[in-house]
C-alpha cells in the first residue's frame, strides 16, 4: 500500500469525490522528512508498516576497517508514495538516507520515469552529520507544476559500486480536461449522417463528454471520453462543440461549423479575350463552390441569328483554369455565351449570357477557270480567272494572290503577286525562258488568304518559239490540268 497525499477535493456534482481515506494538499511542504537532529519536518507520514525492515534495493556494506562488526544495510527511508496536486501549484518532495561516516563522496541523483534529471531542476541535497552517521536529505521542488511533470520520481545513490534506489514518488498533476481530439469542421451532404469525435484526458479521470449543437445539449447525460457523435443528418449549417468535464471542472472545445454541400453559384464575369474567325477565347470567375470542389464546367454557345435554328452547342471543360477556347465556330457570326460549373451535388445555374462575334474568315474556295497564255510580243504571261463564289462569312474580297513558280534545268523560283479585288486578269513578266511556269491563284479577304486554285502550267520556250494557245484549269472532273503549248 502507498501513502497518498492529495489536495482538498472540490466536489463536482457529476462525479464522485476523492477516494475515502486519501488526502489532498496544495501546501508547498516538505513531505515525510526523517527525524534528524536539528530538523523538524513540516509534515510526517508514518510508514505503512512501521518496524518492518526495508528489503528493497539496499547496499550491504562490508566489515569495518577493524573487522569487528557488520554495518546495517543502507536504504532510503520510506516517504510519501503519491502526491496529487493541481496544475500551477508548487510541490516539494524528498528522499532521505542515513549513511555511515566511513563512506565518502556520496551523491544523490534524481530520476524521472527512468531518465536522469540534469540541469535546470531545483534539486538540493543537505547533509546532517552525527557521530557515526550522516543523514542526507535530497529535496526536489517544482514551481507551477504542469501535466508534463506527471511521473514517477526516484533517488539513486552510489556507494562502493553499489546503487541504492528509493521507492518511487508518483506525482499526479490534476487539472481541467485536456483535449486530445476535437471535432473538425466538415462539409457534408444534406440529410446524410456523419460522425464527430471528441476525446479529452485528465487527470483526474474520468472525463465525461457533453455534445453541444447550435447551443443545445445533444446528450442529456455525460458520456465517457472518447465519445463519437453520430449526427443523424443536417438540413442547414450547424455549429458543434463538446464539453469535457472532470472533478476539476469543465473545458469546452472549439466550435466547428458543419456546412451543407449545395450546387455551386453560377460563374460571373464571363469575358472575351480573343476572337478569330472560327474561335473565341473566354474566361470566367467561378461562383461559390457550394462547399464541394468543382468537377468541371460547361460552355454553352448559341448563335444569335434569326435564321439559325436556336440550337445550343455545349463544350465541356475542366473547372480549372477558368478559361476555354471555343472552336469550330462560323466566321463573322454573333454568339451568345454562358458558363455553368458543377460539383458533386450538381450543376450551377448558367452565368449571365454575353455576346461575342467571330471575325471575317478567309475565303473557302479558290478562283475559278484560271487561264494562262504567253504573250511573246510583250514577253509576259497573261492570267485570267473568274471571281470565286465566296460566302458572306468570308468577308469582303480585298484582292488575289498569284503564285508563279519557274522551273528550268533544276532551278526553281517562286514569286508572289498581289492584285486588287476588281481585277480578274493579271500579267506577269517572263522570268526565265526555256522553262515551265506554274500558276496558282487564291482569293484574299481581311480574314486571310483562301485556298489556291489547282496549278496551271505553261511552257515558256526559248526566244522565237511561240504558241499562243492558252493553258487553263481543267473542266470539272478532269484529273490533271491541261498544258497547251
Amino acid at each position: 500500500a502507498i501513502t497518498e497525499a492529495r489536495e482538498e477535493a472540490k466536489p463536482y456534482p457529476l462525479f464522485p469525490g476523492p477516494l475515502p481515506g486519501s488526502l489532498q494538499t496544495d501546501h508547498t511542504s516538505l513531505l515525510s522528512l526523517p527525524h534528524t537532529s536539528g530538523y523538524q519536518p513540516a509534515l510526517m507520514f508514518s510508514p505503512t508498516q512501521p518496524g518492518r525492515p526495508y528489503t528493497g534495493n539496499v547496499a550491504i556494506p562490508r566489515v569495518t576497517s577493524a573487522g569487528s562488526k557488520l554495518l546495517p544495510p543502507l536504504a532510503f527511508k520510506h516517504t510519501v508514495g503519491h502526491i496529487i496536486l493541481s496544475e500551477h501549484k508548487d510541490v516539494k518532495f524528498n528522499c532521505s538516507i542515513s549513511v555511515p561516516n566511513i563512506y565518502q563522496d556520496t551523491t544523490i541523483s534524481w530520476w524521472k520515469d527512468g531518465k536522469e534529471l540534469l540541469g535546470a531542476h531545483h534539486a538540493i541535497t543537505q547533509f546532517y552529520p552525527d557521530d557515526e552517521v550522516t543523514a542526507i536529505i535530497a529535496s526536489f521542488s517544482i514551481t507551477s507544476v504542469q501535466r508534463s511533470d506527471n511521473g514517477s520520481y526516484i533517488c539513486k545513490m552510489k556507494i562502493n559500486n553499489e546503487e541504492i534506489v528509493s521507492d518511487p514518488i508518483y506525482i499526479e498533476v490534476q487539472g481541467l480536461p485536456h483535449f486530445t481530439k476535437q471535432p473538425e469542421s466538415m462539409n457534408v451532404t444534406r440529410n446524410t449522417a456523419f460522425n464527430l469525435t471528441c476525446q479529452a484526458v485528465g487527470p483526474p479521470e474520468p472525463v465525461n463528454i457533453f455534445w453541444v449543437q447550435n447551443s443545445s445539449r445533444v446528450n442529456e447525460q455525460p458520456e465517457k471520453s472518447p465519445s463519437v457523435l453520430t449526427v443523424p443528418g443536417l438540413t442547414e449549417m450547424a455549429v458543434f462543440s463538446c464539453e469535457a468535464h472532470n472533478d476539476k471542472g469543465l473545458t469546452v472545445s472549439k466550435g466547428v461549423q458543419i456546412n451543407i454541400k449545395a450546387i455551386p453559384s453560377p460563374p460571373t464575369e464571363v469575358s472575351i479575350h480573343n476572337s478569330t474567325a472560327h474561335s473565341i477565347l473566354i474566361s470566367w470567375v467561378p461562383g461559390f463552390d457550394g462547399y464541394s470542389p468543382f468537377r468541371n464546367c460547361s460552355v454553352q454557345v448559341k448563335e444569335v441569328d434569326p435564321l439559325s435554328n436556336g440550337s445550343v452547342m455545349i463544350f465541356n471543360t475542366s473547372a480549372s483554369p477558368h478559361m476555354y477556347q471555343i472552336k469550330q465556330l462560323q466566321a463573322l457570326a454573333n454568339y451568345s455565351i454562358g458558363v455553368s460549373c458543377m460539383n458533386e451535388i450538381g450543376w450551377s445555374a448558367v452565368s449571365p449570357w454575353i455576346l461575342a462575334s467571330t471575325t471575317e474568315g478567309a475565303p473557302s474556295v479558290a478562283p475559278l477557270n484560271v487561264t494562262v497564255f504567253l504573250n511573246e510580243s510583250r514577253d509576259n504571261v497573261d492570267i485570267r480567272w473568274m471571281k470565286p463564289l465566296t460566302k458572306r462569312q468570308a468577308g469582303e474580297l480585298v484582292g488575289y494572290r498569284i503564285s508563279h513558280v519557274w522551273q528550268s534545268a533544276g532551278i526553281s523560283k517562286e514569286l508572289l503577286e498581289e492584285v486588287g479585288q476588281n481585277n480578274s486578269r493579271a500579267q506577269i513578266s517572263v522570268q526565265v525562258h526555256n522553262a515551265t511556269c506554274t500558276v496558282r491563284i487564291a482569293a484574299v479577304t481581311k480574314g486571310g488568304v483562301g485556298p489556291f486554285s489547282d496549278p496551271v502550267k505553261i511552257f515558256i520556250p526559248a526566244h522565237g518559239w511561240v504558241d499562243h494557245a492558252p493553258s487553263s484549269t481543267p473542266a470539272p472532273g478532269n484529273a490533271d490540268p491541261v498544258l497547251i503549248i
Epitope: P13, L14, N191, W211, Q213, N214, S216, V218, N219, E220, Q221, P222, E223, L229, P232, G233, T235, A238
Partner: antibody, heavy 118, light 106 residues
C-alpha cells in the same frame, strides 16, 4: 433486450399520494435519462420532465413542480414518480421512457393508469 | 417554450391513399421526432431526428422538414397505420409534443 416495466394501475382519493415505479432492464441504467410523460384521458402527450440517472438530478417541466417528484434507486435500476396531494385532474396514464441523444425517447414503459376519485 | 402545432387534427383516408401530416414549431428547432400511438398502447417510436426510421418501421413512412416546418408522410397506408401520430421537438427545454393527428379510415 431493453425493457421498461411500470407498476400497475392505482386508484387514489384526492389528497392522497401515489408512487409509480419504472424498472429498467437490458441496458446500463445510469447511461440514459428517464423521461416522464402524462396522458390525460382522450388527450395528447404531455412531457413532465426527466431525471438524470447518473447524478440523480431531476428536471421538471412547467406545471410539474412542487407535487411531482422524480427519484431513483440505481441499485435496482428503477426510476420513480411520486405525486402528492392528488387532484382529480391528475387522473391520467403516466409513461416512463428512456431518453437518448437529441431527447429522443426510444423505449417506453407500458404506462400506469392513476385514477383520482372520491 | 416551443409550441408544436399539428395539422390536420384528423385525417380521413382510404387505405392506400397518401397521408401527409404537418407539424409546425413556434420557433426553429433542430430535429423533430415522431411517435405512433394506438388506443390502449404506449407510444411507439416512428421517426428519429426528422428523417431517420426507427428500428422495425416500414419504408412507407418518411419524414422531412427543417426550421419550423416538418412533415410525416405515409406513402400508402396499411390498415395497421390508422392511429394517432405525435411530433416532439429537440432544440430547447422543455421538450414538447404536438397535439397529435388522428389518421382514421374514411
Amino acid at each position: 433486450q431493453v425493457q421498461l416495466v411500470q407498476s400497475g394501475s392505482e386508484l387514489k382519493k384526492p389528497g392522497a399520494s401515489v408512487k409509480v415505479s419504472c424498472k429498467a432492464s437490458g441496458y446500463t441504467f445510469t447511461n440514459y435519462g428517464v423521461h416522464w410523460v402524462r396522458q390525460a384521458p382522450g388527450q395528447g402527450l404531455e412531457w413532465m420532465g426527466w431525471i438524470n440517472t447518473y447524478t440523480g438530478e431531476p428536471t421538471y417541466a412547467q406545471g410539474f413542480t412542487g407535487r411531482f417528484v422524480f427519484s431513483l434507486d440505481t441499485s435496482v435500476s428503477t426510476a420513480y414518480l411520486q405525486i402528492s396531494s392528488l387532484k382529480a385532474e391528475d387522473t391520467a396514464v403516466y409513461y416512463c421512457a428512456r431518453g437518448v441523444r437529441y431527447a429522443y425517447m426510444d423505449y417506453w414503459g407500458q404506462g400506469t393508469l392513476v385514477t383520482v376519485s372520491s | 417554450e416551443i409550441v408544436l402545432t399539428q395539422s390536420p387534427a384528423t385525417l380521413s383516408l382510404s387505405p392506400g391513399e397518401r397521408a401527409t401530416l404537418s407539424c409546425r414549431a413556434s420557433s426553429s428547432v433542430g430535429y423533430m421526432h415522431w411517435y405512433q400511438q394506438k388506443p390502449g398502447q404506449a407510444p411507439r417510436p416512428l421517426i428519429y431526428a426528422t428523417s431517420n426510421l426507427a428500428s422495425g418501421i416500414p419504408a412507407r413512412f418518411s419524414g422531412s422538414g427543417s426550421g419550423t416546418s416538418y412533415t410525416l408522410t405515409i406513402s400508402s397506408p396499411e390498415p395497421e397505420d390508422f392511429a394517432v401520430y405525435y411530433c416532439q421537438q429537440w432544440s430547447s427545454n422543455p421538450r414538447t409534443f404536438g397535439g397529435g393527428t388522428k389518421v382514421e379510415i374514411k
